[in-house]
Every structure is written in C-alpha cells, then in structure tokens.
C-alpha cells in the first residue's frame, strides 16, 4: 500500500455568516495523526505514536499550515452564493501519496453540507464535478472564486502538492512510521447459529501496518471466499488496526478448523475453542 497524508478541513457558516475557526484532522497512512485544537489554536498529535513520529520537534510548522488552509477555506465558503439560513459546512479533503515505485499522486475534494461537488487530480490538473445540478452550481461558484484569487493558480496547486509530499517524506524519515511493526492479538470466538451449526469468528486487533491475511482453514486448506465473511480493516483509534473473518461450521467439526493469520512476514494458526472464547497473543 502507498504511504499517504490526508488533510481533512471543515469550516461552518450560520445564516450566511462564516464562523471563525475551523475543524482539521490529518491522517498519516490511514491513521489519525494530527488534529487542530481550537481552544489552543495549535496542531496536536493524535496519540503516542504520532508524538513519536516527530520526536522532540515542535508542531509549529503543522500549526502554520493548518491555520493557513483553514483561512483559505473560510474565504472560499464566504463566496458560495446559495447559502440558505441555518448551518452549512464546506469541507476540503486533500490527499497525497507516495507509491512503492516512488510515483506520487495527489488529489483534492470539496464537499458542501457533506455532499461532494468538486474534485481535482493535481497531477493531471483535471477537475471533475458530479452530475447533480446542485453540484454543478456549487462547483462553478467555487471554481470562479478560485480563478479570481491569484493564489489559486496552477502553480499554487502544484506547490500545495509539493508541500504535502515534502511533509509526508519528512514523517516517513521517522523510523517510527517506516519500521513500525505491531503484531496482532488474535482471538477466536464461537456462537450458536442455526441448529447443528455454529459461527466461528476470528478477530485480529492492535496490529500495524494495515496489510494482513486472515482466513479460515479446514484441515489446513483455506476455505473458499464465498464461505467466509470478512470485516473491513479499520483503525482502532490507537494508531493500529483491527479486522475479523467469520464462517459457519457444523457443530462437532470444530477440530478441523483453524484461523490462519499472516502479518509482516510472520504467521500463526489459531484453533476453535471448545468453550465460548479463546484469546491468543501471537508471540513472535
């Protein structure tokens, strides 16, 4: 998977008046990394692992970047003409990626009241707008404003892209990100399904990086995809991930089934418990 940096900024308006302040979150490799603390007006690391990425360096640069971006977005919201009474939001999501082959990708997306209305592929300078008339109107509105603003030229977008990549590379220099390996906790549970059947679920949690193989085996052979149900691999809020896989088996055949896990070049197999629950730490 590519390394990525994702900025998520939101500004609000009430009865046509743009509110001061903004909401901002930054994700590094899909994990919550920074957020903007509105009380302290500072960028704050999200959790211990984020603090470890920069070590003892300050977050002044991040604070400056987010503040500037927030200000830009507030100005953009002020130029959206169709603001009705009540609460409205403008959200900008910017992502830059570095792939294994060192190629880079960068994109920008705008949402009004949670609805996507404008996207840009920064490399190709291609803008895309959804079909809906509301999206078309909003997009025209915002693009006209961005064109008027001398700052928002092609050069500006490429600079923004370059800044994002520069920051990402800076974070990746930290061994915390590149060499971080947290083995999963694997836990197998069983629950009664229909008569004569049980559902067995294998959960892997607190692992990093995100890539993992989790599959049920019968007699040592992987079950086919259509007989297993997989959960998404999701952040668990601690800078690590979690996922699960489940299958239905005949009661009395538990001994034939094992959950196979592979992560960061290590693997383990986990039997179905005879009782209700069995928790196993993968000791590498």
């Amino acid at each position: 998977e590519p390394h990525s940096l994702r900025y998520n900024l939101t500004v609000l308006s009430w009865d046509g008046s743009v509110q001061s302040g903004f909401l901002a979150e930054v994700h590094l490799d899909g994990q919550p990394f920074l957020r903007y603390d509105r009380q302290k007006c500072r960028a704050k690391p999200q959790g211990q692992w984020a603090e470890d990425v920069l070590g003892n360096k300050t977050w002044d640069r991040e604070t400056r970047d987010l503040t500037g971006n927030g200000k830009d977005l507030r100005m953009t919201l002020a130029h959206i003409k169709d603001q009705k009474e009540g609460l409205h939001s403008l959200q900008e999501i910017r992502v830059c990626e570095i792939h294994e082959d060192n190629s880079t990708r960068s994109s920008q997306h705008f949402y009004y009241d949670g609805e996507l209305f404008l996207s840009q592929n920064v490399e190709t300078e291609e803008w895309t707008v959804p079909q809906s008339s509301r999206a078309q109107t909003l997009a025209m509105n915002v693009r006209n404003f961005l064109k008027e603003d001398a700052m928002k030229t092609k050069t500006h977008y490429h600079a923004m892209h370059a800044d994002c990549l520069q920051e990402l590379r800076r974070y990746l220099e930290s061994s915390v990100v590149l060499r971080r390996r947290v083995p999963p906790m694997v836990n197998v549970t069983r629950s009664e399904a229909s008569e004569g059947n049980i559902t067995v679920t294998c959960r892997a949690s607190s692992f990093y990086p995100r890539n993992i193989t989790l599959t049920w085996r019968q007699d040592g052979v992987s079950l086919s995809h259509d007989t297993q149900q997989w959960g998404d691999v999701l952040p668990d809020g601690n800078g690590t991930y979690q996922t699960w896989v489940a299958t239905r088996i005949c009661q009395g055949e538990e001994q034939r089934f094992t959950c196979y896990m592979e992560h960061s070049g290590n693997h383990s197999t986990h039997p179905v418990p005879s009782g209700k629950v069995l928790v196993l730490q993968s000791h590498w």
Epitope: G220, V221, T258, T269
Partner: antibody, heavy 118, light 107 residues
Framework: QVQLQQSGPELVKPGASVKVSCKAS????????IYWVKQSHGKSLEWIGY????????VYNQKFKGKATLTVDKSSSTAYMHLNSLTSEDSAVYYC???????????WGQGTLVTVSA | DIQMTQTTSSLSASLGDRVTISCRAS??????LNWYQQKPDGTVKLLIY???RLHSGVPSRFSGSGSGTDYSLTISNLEQEDIATYFC?????????FGSGTKLEIK
C-alpha cells in the same frame, strides 16, 4: 521448491515401536499442516492423521488413534510419526505430505518402508 | 466412513489415446475430490484438486470433472510418462478416504 525428505527403511520386531521422520524444506514449516498416509503392500492409501506444526494440534483417523502419535520439532522443521505395539499389519510404506493451503496432500515425501518381522 | 470406488483396477491403452478413469463416492462429497498419480517407484504427485482444478506444473492433458458422487479423470493424449496408478481421494468428510487405484498400462 517444497521438499519432504523421509527417514530410511526400518525393520522392527513385533511389539516394538518405530519413529518415522519427515524433514521439510523450501517453505515456512509452521505455515502448513503435515499429513501422514499408510500404504500396505499392493493396497490403497489410508489417511492416518495430520498435525499443525505451528501449535502441535493434531487430528487422527479413529482407526489409528492409539497406534500413531504425531509430533513436530519446529527448530529442525521435522515432523515425526511414532508407531507403537507393532504387528505385521503395520508393515507398510508410510508417507508424509503437506499442503500449499489450497489442496490436501499437495506435496509428498518419498515414503518410508516399515517392515515388522520376527 | 465414505467409500471411494474405482471399479477399473487396471486399464490398457495406446499412446495418444484419450483415457478416462472413474471414481464413485458412497455419498455426496460436494466436489471435494482430488486425483493423485503414483509412479512405479512409489513417487506420489497431486494432479487435480477440487474435482477439476489442475495443480501447478501438471500437464494440461489431464483434466477432471464430476459432481455429487460421480467423478472422473481424463488424460486426453496418453504419453509414456503417464504410466502409473491413479488414486481418487475425498476431502469432504473425516476420515479422508482413497479409492483403490486404477493401474494404467500401455497396450
């Protein structure tokens, strides 16, 4: 490539026991089960049981429970089958096999001939 | 236990022939049927798994088919190196069981 190297032929007396070994190479030993199969002279094949080398979990054919004991030594990537209280009925070629995770008995050892004779 | 029956214990065919070996299970095995080749020196190799999936490195002249209780292995163009005994095996239910084998000879 995957290879399973079995120990040499054994000539044993009735009532004695024997330990057949199967050394795996060419893959991560603890990733895949090791299966054991018996072939009596001129006859078909019979599945004895299997072992998960990662945690030592075993599943046996009821017919061979009490006759065969499966173990592994992870440090040497070797699986063992111990056969006890041998009789002439136990004279056979014994094979170990492993899987690629997609099919049973994907790769086989060359077989070990066990002869039980007074 | 599930019985696997290979009614033909030996079969004679000429090089280049199309040869079919059949195997019947005593109950439905849901396509969990594998075919193995045992050479005269005792070497055993997997040919086909899950009824029709060709194991890597096995020549495409080998194919498998069937469902329920009836299965077959076909060699489309018999070659000298195919002289061996062929066993079917079910992997649906424990204990795993094998057919008695079909010995293939050259006419």
């Amino acid at each position: 490539q995957v290879q399973l190297q079995q120990s040499g032929p054994e000539l044993v007396k009735p009532g004695a026991s024997v330990k057949v070994s199967c050394k795996a190479s060419g893959y991560a030993f603890t990733k895949y089960n090791i299966y054991w199969v018996k072939q009596s002279h001129g006859k078909s094949l019979e599945w004895i049981g299997y072992i998960d080398p990662y945690n030592g979990g075993t599943v046996y054919n009821q017919k061979f429970k009490g006759k065969a004991t499966l173990t592994v030594d992870k440090s040497s990537s070797t699986a063992y089958m111990h056969l006890n209280s041998l009789t002439s009925e136990d004279s056979a070629v014994y094979y170990c096999a492993t899987t690629d995770g997609y099919s049973l008995f994907t790769y086989w050892g060359q077989g070990t001939l066990v002869t039980v004779s007074a | 236990d599930i019985q696997m029956t290979q009614t033909t214990s030996s079969l004679s065919a000429s090089l280049g022939d199309r040869v079919t070996i059949s195997c019947r299970a005593s109950q439905d095995i849901s396509n969990y049927l594998n075919w193995y080749q045992q050479k005269p020196d005792g070497t055993v190799k997997l040919l086909i798994y899950y009824t029709s999936r060709l194991h890597s490195g096995v020549p495409s002249r080998f194919s498998g088919s069937g469902s329920g209780t009836d299965y077959s292995l076909t060699i489309s163009n018999l070659e000298q190196e195919d002289i061996a005994t062929y066993f079917c095996q079910q992997g649906n239910t424990l204990p795993f069981t094998f057919g008695s084998g079909t010995k293939l000879e050259i006419k």
